[in-house]
């Protein structure tokens, strides 16, 4: 058993049929010594008396808010949560496996630049009685500071019969140099509590590996005289690291119709303009990627050909 | 300790091409190592990230773009002294700081070159003959060093009398390649910045 936060405790349980469970001793936070009784949740049934209460925690029915009272007055609470371990593996029931970039990916993180700011998100099908708390650091043995905000519900989607909820959090490394060469990864730890179930999820990454630039901005077309060709130009996104001559991007320019199966024109360039063949009912799209360290491509920025 | 913006004339920066080739060569070699050594811990997640130039050179700090010198997190106070007479300095107006930056890059290359050559000698003794260093990568390191053209005492190639542990050597190769790729990215960024300045 360990303390998650004040008056909230996590009991780690090996979860299998007829498991013996864990013996837990609760102590009432009071100078009083006599006349103390214990109850669980909203029940008025007295579980025991005395300053300490010893319980055998085996299942979710044994978890919850234990309260010690004296003469009708509440003295203190202890909330017990369960963390299940099945076949040596901690449960991951609360969050959905996003399976990208690999299986057992529950947390996904992205950074728009090298400033040390990043966003992580996760998915769940649970809509109520759900709380998250996020901590992060650079390295684990001698951790350096990363400050994370509160996790918020950022999107809701319908997936077949189910509703899916996306939560996200923004974090900022306290003293980040965009030009630094990372040797210690960022660690992100998410505590998830659903009703009386506790789970924790972690992700470890270098900012350089989670870079995904914003799409290029200000796409413009200039038709070339006596030609099917069009000159398309664009600018670096505002959120990208500066100076751009140091933090350079490379671009992919594509002309394609509405369907992905349609024919296309595609060209890669390090410049902020390119010449392509425009077709009726097609769109010109441009996306960006770090020129020197191939992490993710940005989303597409598009303009219609006409 | 930074690069001023008034540096070489446009198109007068012969190191840019070599640095681009360097990054391609090391990325290619790392990809090859990850494929060939698929049953060894050779991915970024599996290896320890070591920097053989730590406390010996200060490339990131010495080559910091002017725009980032306002960022206190970028201003580490590691001081190193360098020789300053490189041929990539295509203009006489080149500052002392830029010379310091380029000589730091030269020292990095020299250190990695020695490590890679020592390692290759060990890998050539491996009866499995599983992996060797790409001669193209070694040649590209050499070309960039020649383009930088700094006078520096030669570092003797390390020789070891004991029987090499090929498993450890291959893991060290992965560690070295990952670190060198990161440094090659920095070098490419610096050369691109200098070329644009």
């Amino acid at each position: 058993i360990w303390e998650l936060k004040k008056d909230v405790y996590v009991v780690e349980l090996d979860w299998y049929p007829d498991a013996p469970g864990e013996m837990v001793v609760l102590t009432c936070d009071t100078p009083e010594e006599d006349g103390i009784t214990w109850t669980l949740d909203q029940s008025s049934e007295v579980l025991g008396s005395g300053k300490t209460l010893t319980i055998q925690v085996k299942e979710f029915g044994d978890a919850g808010q234990y309260t010690c009272h004296k003469g009708g007055e509440v003295l203190s609470h202890s909330l017990l949560l369960l963390h299940k371990k099945e076949d040596g593996i901690w449960s991951t029931d609360i969050l959905k496996d996003q399976k990208e970039p690999k299986n057992k990916t529950f947390l996904r993180c992205e950074a728009k630049n090298y400033s040390g700011r990043f966003t992580c998100w996760w998915l769940t099908t649970i809509s109520t009685d759900l709380t998250f708390s996020v901590k992060s650091s650079r390295g684990s043995s001698d951790p350096q500071g990363v400050t994370c905000g509160a996790a918020t519900l950022s999107a809701e989607r319908v997936r077949g019969d189910n509703k899916e909820y996306e939560y996200s959090v923004e974090c900022q490394e306290d003293s980040a140099c965009p030009a630094a060469e990372e040797s210690l990864p960022i660690e992100v730890m998410v505590d998830a509590v659903h009703k009386l179930k506790y789970e924790n999820y972690t992700s470890s990454f270098f900012i350089r590996d989670i870079i995904k630039p914003d799409p290029p901005k200000n796409l413009q077309l200039k038709p070339l005289k006596n030609s099917r060709q069009v000159e398309v130009s664009w600018e670096y996104p505002d959120t990208w690291s500066t100076p751009h001559s140091y933090f350079s991007l490379t671009f992919c320019v594509q002309v394609q119709g509405k369907s992905k199966r349609e024919k296309k024109d595609r060209v890669f360039t390090d410049k902020t303009s390119a010449t392509v063949i425009c077709r009726k009912n097609a769109s010109i799209s441009v996306r960006a990627q770090d020129r020197y360290y191939s992490s993710s491509w940005s989303e597409w920025a598009s303009v219609p050909c006409s | 300790r930074n690069l001023p913006v008034a540096t070489p004339d446009p198109g007068m920066f012969p190191c840019l091409h070599h640095s681009q080739n360097l990054l391609r060569a090391v990325s290619n070699m790392l990809q090859k190592a990850r494929q060939t050594l698929e049953f060894y811990p050779c991915t970024s997640e599996e290896i320890d990230h070591e920097d053989i130039t730590k406390d010996k050179t200060s490339t990131v700090e010495a080559c910091l773009p002017l725009e980032l010198t306002k960022n206190e997190s970028c201003l580490n106070s590691r001081e190193t002294s360098f020789i300053t007479n490189g041929s990539c300095l295509a203009s006489r107006k080149t500052s002392f700081m830029m010379a310091l930056c380029l000589s730091s890059i030269y020292e990095d290359l020299k250190m990695y070159q020695v490590e890679f050559k020592t390692m290759n000698a060990k890998l050539l003794m491996d009866p499995k003959r599983q992996i060797f260093l790409d001669q193209n990568m070694l040649a590209v390191i050499d070309e960039l060093m020649q383009a930088l053209n700094f006078n520096s005492e030669t570092v003797p190639q390390k020789s070891s009398l004991e029987e090499p542990d090929f498993y450890k050597t291959k893991i060290k190769l992965c560690i070295l390649l990952h670190a060198f790729r990161i440094r090659a990215v920095t070098i490419d960024r610096v050369m691109s910045y200098l070329n644009a300045s």
Epitope: R228, Q229, T250, R261, E262, K263, K264, D265, R266, V267, F268, T269, D270, T275, I277, R279, K280 | -
Partner: antibody, heavy 118, light 107 residues
């Protein structure tokens, strides 16, 4: 199976015009760009131009501009290359090639040898 | 027009050898470069597109590499069926242009 089948060999006199065909099968004709590339004996490959069969848009290499016409007939799934004012240096194998991507060539015809000789 | 220069123009090699062919562009073409194999009397066949992207059905011993102006095609462990002429082609701008070809011959 995506396939391009070209018409047979041609022998032409200098100054004449040649028209060769390229019949597509195994895909929707207008879904791919169609190019023409030639190869002189013991020489390399030379791109001549392309057509978008969907709308008839064409683009030619400057070297052939004014002498070459590329057309496409969607009713027969056939592309054509017409080259006029033939000279001896036009002796070559002419290939049609197609792809969903405009700038490189995924599927090739078997080639048509055009000999220009007096 | 962008000039593409291949080297060597021919190379003699044995089965099992590792062969590398290079292609240089007269100006930077990013990764807009493609490789083809041509056997005598046959049409060319696409091997690699956009400098390093492999084509399904093409043996994994063929690998492409490079960007900017310098590119290479490597055949790891040359097989009897690999003796042919190889061409690079740039798609950075029109007109599309090819390298002069590299003939891989049996030693």
């Amino acid at each position: 199976e995506v396939q391009l089948v070209q018409s047979g060999a041609e022998v032409k006199k200098p100054g004449a015009t040649v028209k060769i065909s390229c019949k597509a099968s195994g895909y929707t004709f207008s879904d791919y760009y169609l190019h023409w590339v030639r190869q002189a004996p013991e020489k390399g490959l030379e791109w001549m131009g392309w057509i978008d069969p969907e709308n008839g848009d064409t683009e030619y290499a400057p070297k052939f501009q004014g002498r070459v016409t590329i057309t496409a007939d969607t009713s027969t799934d056939t592309g054509y290359l017409e080259l006029s004012s033939l000279r001896s240096e036009d002796t070559a194998v002419y290939y049609c090639a197609a792809n969903k991507e405009l700038r490189y060539f995924d599927v090739w015809g078997q080639g048509t040898l055009v000999t220009v000789s007096s | 027009d962008i000039q593409m220069t291949q080297s060597p123009s021919s190379v003699s090699a044995s089965v099992g050898d590792r062969v590398t062919i290079t292609c240089r562009a007269s100006q930077s073409i990013s990764i807009n470069l493609h490789w083809y194999q041509q056997k005598p009397g046959k049409a060319p066949k696409l091997l690699i597109y956009f400098a390093s992207q492999s084509i399904s059905g093409v043996p994994s011993r063929f690998s492409g590499y490079g960007s900017g102006t310098d590119f290479s095609l490597t055949i790891n462990s040359l097989q009897p069926e690999d003796f042919a002429t190889y061409y690079c082609q740039q798609s950075n701008s029109f007109p599309l242009t090819f390298g002069g070809g590299t003939k891989v011959e049996i030693k």
